[in-house]
C-alpha cells in the first residue's frame, strides 16, 4: 500500500455502508470499492499525477521554503459512479445506475 | 492564517518567479498572488468546501477508522489565469493575457 513515502497513487479502500451509517437508505451493495488517493506529491511532479500549473508552482515554492508552504496534495481528480439500490421517499426499492462521484478513477497532485 | 486546526480556506501565497527559477523566461510580473489552500477537512464537511460524495464518504470512514484512512484534503478546486510577459522563440517580449491555472480561485475538500 502507498505510505507517506510513496508517490501519489490510487489505493484500495473498501467501504462498508453500515460503517458510515448509510445502510439505512442504501440497500445494496453492502460495500463497494471507493479507492483512496495516497502518497506524496514530491518534486519533480510526474506527468501521471497530471499536475496543474499551480501545483507545480506550489511544489517549487515548498522546495525553497518547506516550512512556509505545504506540498501539493494527492487527491481524486476523476471520479466514477457506482450503481446502488436504495429506498425512495415512499420506501420503494429503486435502482440508481449512476450514483455519481463515489469511486476514484484517477488521482493527481493538486 | 489558516493552520492545521483551521478549516479549509484560501490563504495568501506571494510567489516570486526568481525563487522558483522561472525568471529565466517570465519577464514580468516579478511576483504574483498564487494563493494556497490551507486547513483541515473536518467532519461535518461544510457546503463552502463543495465536497464530492467521495470526500464525504472518506471523511466518514476516517471518523470510524482514523488510523486506516486519511481525511479529505484541502486543495484548489478552481483556478484562475494570470497575465505574463515572456520571451518567444525569437526573443520577442510577448504578452500572454491568460496563462491558465496559476492562481487559486476556490478551495475545497477532495
Amino acid at each position: 500500500s502507498a505510505g507517506a513515502g510513496s508517490h501519489c497513487q490510487k489505493t484500495s479502500l473498501r467501504v462498508n455502508f453500515e460503517d458510515i451509517g448509510w445502510d439505512s437508505w442504501i440497500i445494496a451493495p453492502k460495500e463497494y470499492e471507493a479507492y483512496e488517493c495516497k502518497g506524496g506529491c514530491f518534486f519533480p511532479l510526474a506527468d501521471d499525477v497530471t499536475p496543474t500549473k499551480h501545483a507545480i508552482v506550489q511544489t517549487l515554492v515548498h522546495l525553497k521554503f518547506p516550512t512556509k508552504v505545504g506540498k501539493a496534495c494527492c487527491v481524486p481528480t476523476k471520479l466514477s459512479p457506482i450503481s446502488v439500490l436504495y429506498k425512495d421517499d415512499m420506501g420503494v426499492p429503486t435502482l440508481k445506475y449512476h450514483y455519481e462521484g463515489m469511486s476514484v478513477a484517477e488521482c493527481g497532485c493538486r | 492564517s489558516a493552520g492545521a486546526g483551521s478549516h479549509c480556506q484560501k490563504t495568501s501565497l506571494r510567489v516570486n518567479f526568481e525563487d522558483i527559477g522561472w525568471d529565466s523566461w517570465i519577464i514580468a510580473p516579478k511576483e504574483y498572488e498564487a494563493y494556497e489552500c490551507k486547513g483541515g477537512c473536518f467532519f461535518p464537511l461544510a457546503d463552502d468546501v463543495t465536497p464530492t460524495k467521495h470526500a464525504i464518504v472518506q471523511t466518514l470512514v476516517h471518523l470510524k477508522f482514523p488510523t486506516k484512512v486519511g481525511k479529505a484534503c484541502c486543495v484548489p478546486t478552481k483556478l484562475s489565469p494570470i497575465s505574463v510577459l515572456y520571451k518567444d522563440d525569437m526573443g520577442v517580449p510577448t504578452l500572454k493575457y491568460h496563462y491558465e491555472g496559476m492562481s487559486v480561485a476556490e478551495c475545497g475538500c477532495r
Partner: antibody, heavy 119, light 111 residues
Framework: EVQLVESRGGLVQPGGSMRLSCAAS????????MNWVRQAPGKGLEWVAH??????????HYAESVRGRFTISRDDSKNSVYLQMNSLKTEDTGVYYC??????????WGQGTLVTVSS | DIVMTQSPDSLAVSLGERATINCRAS??????????MNWFQQKPGQPPKLLIY???NQGSGVPDRFSGSGSGTDFTLTISSLQAEDVAVYFC?????????FGQGTKLEIK
C-alpha cells in the same frame, strides 16, 4: 537575419493614393503582428496601423489621423504587409517604417521609405 | 489616448558622465503587475532600435550602461557612462492601450 524591406515611396499630390508594401524574412511572419509607424521630417514617431494574426481574424487598428483613409493588409503566404493610403494630405508626409512584433512591442524595423505629399 | 511626455527635449552630457531621460504618462501604463513601457534609440538616418522593454529589461545586444526604471506613470532611462556612439534621439513608448503612443523624443548630444 531578420529583414523588413519597404517598397520605394515617392511623391504624390494631395488627394492622391499610394500603396506601400513590406517584404519580411528571417522570422516566422505569420506569428507576428505587423505595423506601420511614421515619422514626419524632423519630428517624432507616430504609430499608424497594425494588423494582428490569423487567429485574431486579422484584426486591424488605426490611428485616428488615418482612419477611413488608410488600409493595412497582409499576405502570410508572401510574408508581406501592405499599407494602402488614399486621400493623402500634406501632413501624411514622412518616413514610413514597417515594423513587426508582438502584442507588446515593436521588435523588428525596416529602414523606412519616404512618402512626400505635395503639389 | 495615453500621452507620453519626455523631459528634457534635449540634453548635452560629457563623455563618461551619466545621462538621465524622464518620461511621464498621462495615466498609469501598468497592468497585471507589468509595465507597458519601452524605450527606443534612433541614430541619425536609421530606424529606431528597441533599447529597454517592460520598463527595466534590456533589449537584445544592448550594452549594460543602459538601464530603465520606474512604474505607473513615471519612468527613467539612464546611461551610466556616455559613449560617443550613444548620440541619438531617445523615445519612450507605451503599449498598454491602442493607439500605442510615443514620447516626443529627447535629443542626446555630447557636451
Amino acid at each position: 537575419e531578420v529583414q523588413l524591406v519597404e517598397s520605394r515611396g515617392g511623391l504624390v499630390q494631395p488627394g492622391g493614393s499610394m500603396r506601400l508594401s513590406c517584404a519580411a524574412s528571417g522570422f516566422t511572419f505569420s506569428n507576428y503582428w505587423m505595423n506601420w509607424v511614421r515619422q514626419a521630417p524632423g519630428k517624432g514617431l507616430e504609430w499608424v496601423a497594425h494588423i494582428r494574426l490569423k487567429s485574431d481574424n486579422y484584426a486591424t487598428h488605426y490611428a485616428e489621423s488615418v482612419r477611413g483613409r488608410f488600409t493595412i493588409s497582409r499576405d502570410d503566404s508572401k510574408n508581406s504587409v501592405y499599407l494602402q493610403m488614399n486621400s493623402l494630405k500634406t501632413e501624411d508626409t514622412g518616413v514610413y517604417y514597417c515594423t513587426g512584433g508582438s502584442n507588446y512591442v515593436f521588435a523588428f524595423w525596416g529602414q523606412g521609405t519616404l512618402v512626400t505629399v505635395s503639389s | 489616448d495615453i500621452v507620453m511626455t519626455q523631459s528634457p527635449d534635449s540634453l548635452a552630457v560629457s563623455l563618461g558622465e551619466r545621462a538621465t531621460i524622464n518620461c511621464r504618462a498621462s495615466e498609469s501604463v501598468d497592468n497585471y503587475g507589468i509595465s507597458f513601457m519601452n524605450w527606443f534609440q534612433q541614430k541619425p538616418g536609421q530606424p529606431p532600435k528597441l533599447l529597454i522593454y517592460a520598463a527595466s529589461n534590456q533589449g537584445s545586444g544592448v550594452p549594460d550602461r543602459f538601464s530603465g526604471s520606474g512604474s505607473g506613470t513615471d519612468f527613467t532611462l539612464t546611461i551610466s557612462s556616455l559613449q560617443a556612439e550613444d548620440v541619438a534621439v531617445y523615445f519612450c513608448q507605451q503599449s498598454k492601450e491602442v493607439p500605442w503612443t510615443f514620447g516626443q523624443g529627447t535629443k542626446l548630444e555630447i557636451k
